[in-house]
């Protein structure tokens, strides 16, 4: 029959070449003399003249060695013809398998692996995978089959089997307790792959296992007991700047220390925060010490991390003793605003109030007194016993220096300390009214008609307050009542003045005397300007002469 | 000398809890895993949790997960495994041992729990 | 995951030598050489007999051996011995989430 089964060659082989591999036969050779020939890649196409057939006998040649890794199979065709050139049987299919022979090792894909675990995790932990590969066959023979092991461990701390390999997959686990970034940062694996499933070929690579970091170490106070001194009264003031020390990785969460004051800071006097480089703990005040009262602040500090811990860690507690140190303070006027009544117009030399102040140090120093600010210059305050005397008139009504019946008054005092400080406070006066003022009527001057004329308003105004203001009463004087009439009105505070009789064009005083409900009377002139008008006017018509 | 020794155990009901510890002596506790393995009555063994040397690493079968919490006191040499929510097939002898990933050794001398109404 | 395969029981007249299998899958016994057997006495605690497939802690006989080929793992005692008579079981390191499996256990007879 004119078939061949495929024909398995194994790559590599040795010759000699060339070698014969099979023989086409067609059974027409009987009848007539036949030519072999064959084609295909491998033959008369690239890679042209790997096979060859001898023409007359129909042996298949194998010119030289073949590469399975190159081609694993050739398709080649194979012809018969008669001397004419005539065919004589059907192109027949040669399957030619190249079988493998372990002519390849194994190759890393990288040179180095990089992988990391972190610190303290149990075995078993997947750390990272490295591959090989075989160019040889893995699926017919063992050729390609890669097994992973691990030849060597740098360093062999704390001991020399910290991982393993998975034998087919090349997954690096960890197989032991122990990890701790704080002693061995990075292992250096050497790993081997080795071919014909572990009896074969080996080729080597390094797998670095960077061990990452846990907070599994607390910050220590280093120094754990700390003295400082502090001037009294100073806000955000350095006290102290606590150093810890801390295993884990620098400016790593593990590593970045927060202070919390445990005790000995009842009254919330001071404030503890991280230097962000330094990772130092900084003590400041919040608010000002005050020796006098309390001379020494004994604070107890602890330290833990922004990162929570992986274990239970004791953690590290500083003492800082912090000595106040005492400062000459500024005397302290008690209250600091003093409000004082008082009434308006009281003669000069009535004593207003005494006005003192206390100074907070202990020593019993002597205190001095002074006006800063008395914009009217009304009153007076003796230096020894701060006593405040009236000097000037205290006018309520005074709109420049008072301001809803309240006159303010800048006292100062000052302590006899090297140096001297200075404290000052507010004396706010409250005048009581007194009636010193009477109703006055606005406007003074008026136009009016001498034919039909019009009731002029005026309001009424007094200084004085209630009691001392309406209702008010209305008079008139020096016969200016032959002319005129003046009436308040029902609720007193207006006052219509009318005329009574015809008044030639001309300018007239009317003389009104007003008084308020404390009876305080006070006269005032009306200037009348008569019109030759009738009703209602603003300003005379035509030219008017003064009389 | 190396020991391990297991107490907390005892009978308590479908639903209820218990606390086992074991005490470690004579190694240097805080460098090793530790583990809990149990056999029920009759059966073989099961490794029930696990626990990094330092604490921070955890590992449970998942027939206790969320019931059971593995931890450790490093300054104390003691494993503990606090067991809610138990069921009946939950008693067993469990066992402490120190695991080093490869195997386990050495193993507590166990302690009983009976989960029964 | 299923735990290791050993048989149930084996047995054997002291002075004799037997073998027990322990058989795993390429994850496990067949992926490490991390294979360790327990002797078990009734009510006792087990106790490690080998590690790392063959090696011996100090105080074990050496009459206890252990090898592994493929994905199965085996403990052979020679010399059996009346004290011998106990359960076995095999451990294997494995990839996680389980990390250690162990087999079911073998009951020992000394005949």
């Known amino acids: 029959d004119w078939v061949v089964a495929p024909i398995s060659v194994p790559e590599n082989g040795k010759g000699p070449f060339p070698q014969r591999l099979n023989q086409l036969k067609s059974n027409k050779d009987r009848d007539t003399k036949i030519f072999y020939s064959i084609t295909g890649p491998g033959a008369d196409s690239p890679p042209e003249g790997v096979f060859a057939v001898e023409k007359e006998t129909g042996w298949l040649l194998l010119n030289k060695p073949l590469d399975r890794e190159e081609i694993a199979k050739y398709e080649l065709f194979g012809h018969a013809v008669s001397e004419n050139g005539a065919s004589v049987e059907d192109p027949m299919n040669i399957s030619i398998i190249v079988t493998d022979q372990n002519d390849h090792k194994p190759k890393f894909t990288q040179d180095t692996f990089r992988g990391s675990v972190l610190e303290g995790v149990l075995p078993g932990t997947s750390v990272m995978q490295v591959t090989a590969t075989d160019e040889d066959d893995a699926i017919y023979t063992y050729n390609g089959v890669v097994a992973y092991s691990i030849h060597s461990q740098e360093p062999k701390d704390p001991h020399d089997l910290m991982f393993t390999i998975h034998r087919s997959t090349g997954t690096i686990s960890v197989i032991s307790s122990g990890l701790d970034r704080e002693k061995v940062p990075e292992y250096t694996l050497t790993i081997q792959a080795t071919d014909m499933d572990g009896d074969g070929s080996t080729t080597t690579a390094v797998a670095v296992v960077e061990i990452l970091d846990a907070n599994d170490n607390a910050p220590m106070f280093d120094p754990q007991k700390y003295e400082a001194h502090v001037p009294e009264n100073a806000v955000g003031h350095e006290v102290q700047r606590l150093t810890v020390t801390d295993l884990d990785a620098p400016n790593s969460p593990a590593w970045r220390a927060t202070y919390l004051i445990m005790g000995g800071d009842d009254g919330d006097h001071f404030t503890i925060t991280t230097h962000p480089e330094s990772n130092q703990g900084i003590l400041t005040t919040r608010k000002g010490l005050d020796f006098e009262a309390k001379n020494q602040h004994t604070l107890y500090v602890e330290v833990t991390n922004e990162a929570p811990f992986v274990l239970k860690l004791p953690t590290s507690t500083a003492t800082i003793v912090v000595h106040v140190e005492d400062v000459n303070e500024a005397p302290v006027f008690v209250p600091p605003s003093k409000v004082v009544e008082v009434q308006e117009g009281i003669p000069t030399g009535e004593p207003v109030c005494v006005y003192t102040a206390e100074d907070p140090d202990k020593e019993n120093q002597k205190i001095s007194y002074r006006i800063l600010r008395d914009p009217a210059g009304w009153l007076a305050m003796d230096p020894d016993s701060g006593q405040v005397t009236a000097v000037g008139t205290l006018d309520r009504e005074d709109e420049q220096f008072v301001r809803n019946n309240i006159y303010e008054v800048m006292v100062l005092a000052m302590d006899n300390g090297s140096p001297p400080t200075t404290g000052t406070g507010t004396l706010l006066l409250t005048l009581i009214d007194v009636n010193d003022h009477g109703p006055v009527p606005e406007p003074r001057q008026i136009t009016i008609c001498n034919q039909s004329p019009v009731r002029q308003v005026l309001n009424i105004t007094d200084k004085d307050l209630s009691p001392h203001t309406s209702p008010f009463q209305a008079q008139l004087t020096d016969d200016s009542d032959i002319y005129w009439t003046a009436e308040v009105n029902e609720e007193g505070d207006t006052v219509v003045l009318s005329l009574k009789k015809f008044l030639k064009q001309d300018t007239y005083d009317v003389h009104l005397s007003l008084s308020d409900h404390g009876n305080k009377e006070q006269l005032t002139v009306i200037r009348a300007t008569v019109c030759d008008c009738h009703g209602h006017v603003e300003t005379c018509p035509g030219p008017w002469k003064g009389g | 000398e190396v020991q391990l020794l297991e107490s907390g155990g005892g009978l308590v009901q479908p639903g209820g809890s218990l606390r086992l510890s074991c005490a470690a002596s004579?190694?240097?506790?805080?460098?090793?895993?530790m583990s809990w393995v149990r056999q029920a009555p009759g059966k073989g063994l099961e490794w029930v949790s696990a626990?990094?040397?330092?604490?921070?690493?955890?590992y449970y079968a998942d027939s206790v997960k969320g019931r059971f919490t593995i931890s450790r006191d490093n300054s104390k040499n003691t494993l503990y495994l606090q067991m809610n929510s138990l069921r009946a097939e939950d008693t067993a002898v469990y066992y402490c041992?120190?695991?080093?990933?490869?195997?386990?050794?050495?193993w507590g001398q166990g302690t009983m729990v009976t989960v029964s109404s | 995951q299923s735990a290791l395969t050993q048989p149930a029981s084996v047995s054997g007249s002291p002075g004799q030598s037997i073998t027990i299998s322990c058989t795993g899958t390429?994850?496990?016994?067949?992926?490490?050489?991390?294979v360790s057997w327990y002797q078990q006495h009734p009510g006792k605690a087990p106790k490690l007999i080998l590690s790392?497939?063959?090696k011996r802690p100090s105080g074990v006989s050496n009459r206890f051996s252990g090898s592994k080929s493929g994905n199965t793992a085996s403990l052979s005692i020679s010399g059996l011995q009346a004290e011998d008579e106990a359960d076995y079981y095999c451990?294997?390191?494995?990839?996680?989430?389980?990390?250690?499996?162990f087999g079911g256990g073998t009951k020992l007879t000394v005949l």
């Open positions: 041992a120190s695991w080093g990933g490869g195997w386990f050794d050495p």
């Open positions: 390429s994850n496990d016994v067949g992926a490490y050489n991390y």
């Open positions: 004579g190694f240097t506790f805080s460098s090793y895993a």
């Open positions: 451990s294997s390191f494995t990839s996680g989430p389980v990390f250690n499996l």
């Open positions: 626990i990094s040397g330092s604490g921070g690493s955890t």
């Open positions: 790392e497939v063959n």
